[in-house]
Amino acid sequence: QRKRRNTIHEFKKSAKTTLIKIDPALKIKTKKVNTADQCANRCTRNKGLPFTCKAFVFDKARKQCLWFPFNSMSSGVKKEFGHEFDLYENKDYIRNCIIGKGRSYKGTVSITKSGIKCQPWSSMIPHEHSFLPSSYRGKDLQENYCRNPRGEEGGPWCFTSNPEVRYEVCDIPQCSEVECMTCNGESYRGLMDHTESGKICQRWDHQTPHRHKFLPERYPDKGFDDNYCRNPDGQPRPWCYTLDPHTRWEYCAIKTCADNTMNDTDVPLETTECIQGQGEGYRGTVNTIWNGIPCQRWDSQYPHEHDMTPENFKCKDLRENYCRNPDGSESPWCFTTDPNIRVGYCSQIPNCDMSHGQDCYRGNGKNYMGNLSQTRSGLTCSMWDKNMEDLHRHIFWEPDASKLNENYCRNPDDDAHGPWCYTGNPLIPWDYCPISRCEGDTTPTIVNLDHPVISCAKTKQLRVVNGIPTRTNIGWMVSLRYRNKHICGGSLIKESWVLTARQCFPSRDLKDYEAWLGIHDVHGRGDEKCKQVLNVSQLVYGPEGSDLVLMKLARPAVLDDFVSTIDLPNYGCTIPEKTSCSVYGWGYTGLINYDGLLRVAHLYIMGNEKCSQHHRGKVTLNESEICAGAEKIGSGPCEGDYGGPLVCEQHKMRMVLGVIVPGRGCAIPNRPGIFVRVAYYAKWIHKIILTYKVPQS
């Protein structure tokens, strides 16, 4: 039996889009199906359709096809956003160039090479002919458009409206002439969909006939649209996987653009390793801002919309996501991939005319020897020799004094989060410095994340009396109040310290907050005897990108039957998959008559790979995140629970393994929760507790 060809490669996909017909005369046809491929096959073959199919929409929610005799360029039609819809348009009808002899060309050019208007195919005036639309079904002999129904040598042609000229070819360019690229085409985002030998490209979102790793959702910045040629991996030029099972991949024939956009006057001196002047000529590949946050691609509008695109600034080399200075700013910069931080300067790039020492660090920066002497919050570092006593207090070996010169940022204690320094400010004894890891350095700061090498529990003593959970064993749960209302959860990890989330502090005025401990009811009803209300004296923000905050209480909590601390895990530990854990919170429950009592949801630990699959590959987890899925569909953390803990038990010991942070949806069915991995930040937490002064009880 002949294998039916998969025709979805012949369509251009527009995700989350549908077409709405404004003209009621336009027909559509619908049917329930399982996949978009089925819709495509039927559209291509026009099987059972009362019109020539030019596009279709696949409704993922209803598993339904909507076939159209029109596309987004047709009149009487408008595009509309819709989460559940994907629009597929037959490329032949929207392409304005030809492939090979142009047999598949179905565009709307209707003028010949010498400028004569074409005669309609259904007309016999001025020229009689046998090319009737009814005789050439599927060849789209519509209106008076140029066509090549027999695949003849000269390309698309038509009978002309001039009685003296029977027929003439049309001047439609080859797609390979229209398409062009700059450099090696890493930033090429054109519509070439066949290789240099004419093989049709395989869709990037398909795994047949060739399995591959370049999934569009895993690499959203690589432009993996439909089956267009791309260069995601630094090849000499764009390429694609092919539909030929015997040819895995092939290069595409895309010519280099004739670059006449460069203005010879006022061209800045190009540098790759350092900045000259304001860095307008910097052409290096640093692609993070000063604090290590990766840059957004210049050709992307997510997470930040902007007009600094390669198209608008052609001679500014806005490739990939490299730091550049296209607008005369004070130094190279970029939009960041952090939705909360729009732009940042790449101030870690050294100045050409100023030996600045190293301006980035490798691994965790313990060998960093640069000259930076300022913290991320702008405080000037204080001299190491004035702080040796404090340093000895929290490290158990003799630091290398030869490295601790002046007041430069260093990492004498093997801190996982990079170089730091003392500040001389009694409120902020030390902080991290705004230096990022060296470009290309991928050394993990914790190894073997998915292998349970280090146990998370410190000891093996029994923690729950007789194994009966009572009210007292949630004594570490904190209700953070903002202007007298519950806003977030938190975990009491030491008498004076609460671990919570950065987003829980809308105001910078600490008088707006207080911490309630020892309560079961969010309003404190019936908890009068056990409730402790404490003011907040300081917020210590976690390492860049952590979303963590250590909240210092104005006085230590009194530990009793109702208030207790919860243990931290060992640094870098891994909890085994399927370990049963719980999240606690006073947040949104989905119930109208919520009683205000502390709730618990039971989750189980899921490996990062598996977790990513459950998120349909849209989320790549890193070593600072931990994932847990619900045992009960649709249960999990939500608004009001943020800052609260993911608590797991190992060797009969309960620990806070994760912190609930916003941004991952609210208890979405079949989507496991992603939490901040406390084990990754455990050393930072211990260091803060050890070095920051707290009031005595």
């Epitope: 509008q301 202007r483 809308p506 910078r508 009001g640 941004g663």
Partner: antibody
């Protein structure tokens, strides 16, 4: 981008809901705010909704307005408008998940309250 | 409350001149202050944030300074395009705030 809608001519006391539709960024990363401007007057901050779902209102706006959100929209409900509520209402994105400056504004939607 | 007072309400300046606008907070807001420019029929445009940081695409003739309770916006080498109303906004806290914005300063360019 952000775009306001729902502004129209209403009579005093007729409830009105203004909607701010966002695209190109996620409401799980940014706080959102409503600001208004009466004809020939200055900017007047009304309310903010933070990433964690908490809300804040200007002291004069408490009880007079309600801010809420879905995954892609932020609403401002005016349960009982008065003639003093005639203004252009702007939706603005806060440059953070918490209170900060506004780095993205909508074009505004005009509300006219008149009997 | 963290309320903002802006002065003057209006100022006239010649092309090429310098204009100074002041903004006072009712209590200390550290450096959490932003400045906006608004032209008729348009939404406000961010100029300065964190008291002195220039927003992307804003010309360097705009300069912000100050901390605590006293802040200043200075426009030097004024151009015709700078004719607009300027507002300050505190980005510190909205606890019991009447208005996060100052009353505005109209800059008229002669």
């Amino acid at each position: 981008s952000v775009e306001e809608s729902g502004g129209r001519l209403v009579t005093p006391g007729t409830p009105l809901t203004l909607t701010c539709t966002v695209s190109g960024f996620s409401l799980s990363a940014y706080a959102m705010s409503w600001v208004r401007q009466a004809p020939e007057k200055g900017l007047e901050w009304i309310a903010v909704i933070y990433v964690i779902g908490a809300t804040d209102y200007a002291s004069w706006a408490k009880g007079r307005f309600t801010i809420s959100r879905t995954s892609t929209t932020v609403d401002l409900r005016i349960p009982s408008p008065t003639t003093e509520d005639t203004a252009t209402y702007f939706c603005a994105r806060v440059y953070d998940s918490v209170w900060n400056h506004f780095n993205l504004w909508g074009p505004g939607t005009l509300v006219t309250v008149s009997s | 409350a963290y309320d903002m007072t802006q002065t003057p309400a209006s100022v006239e300046v010649a092309v090429g001149g310098t204009v100074t606008i002041k903004c006072q907070a009712s209590q200390s807001i550290s450096s959490w202050l932003a400045w906006y420019q608004q032209k008729p029929g348009q939404p406000p445009k961010l100029l300065i944030y964190q008291a002195s940081k220039l927003a992307s695409g804003v010309p360097s003739r705009f300069k912000g300074s100050g901390s605590g309770t006293e802040f200043t916006l200075t426009i030097s080498g004024v151009e015709c395009a700078d004719a607009a109303t300027y507002y300050c906004q505190q980005a510190y806290s909205v606890s019991n705030v009447d208005n996060a914005f100052g009353g505005g300063t109209e800059v008229v360019v002669k």
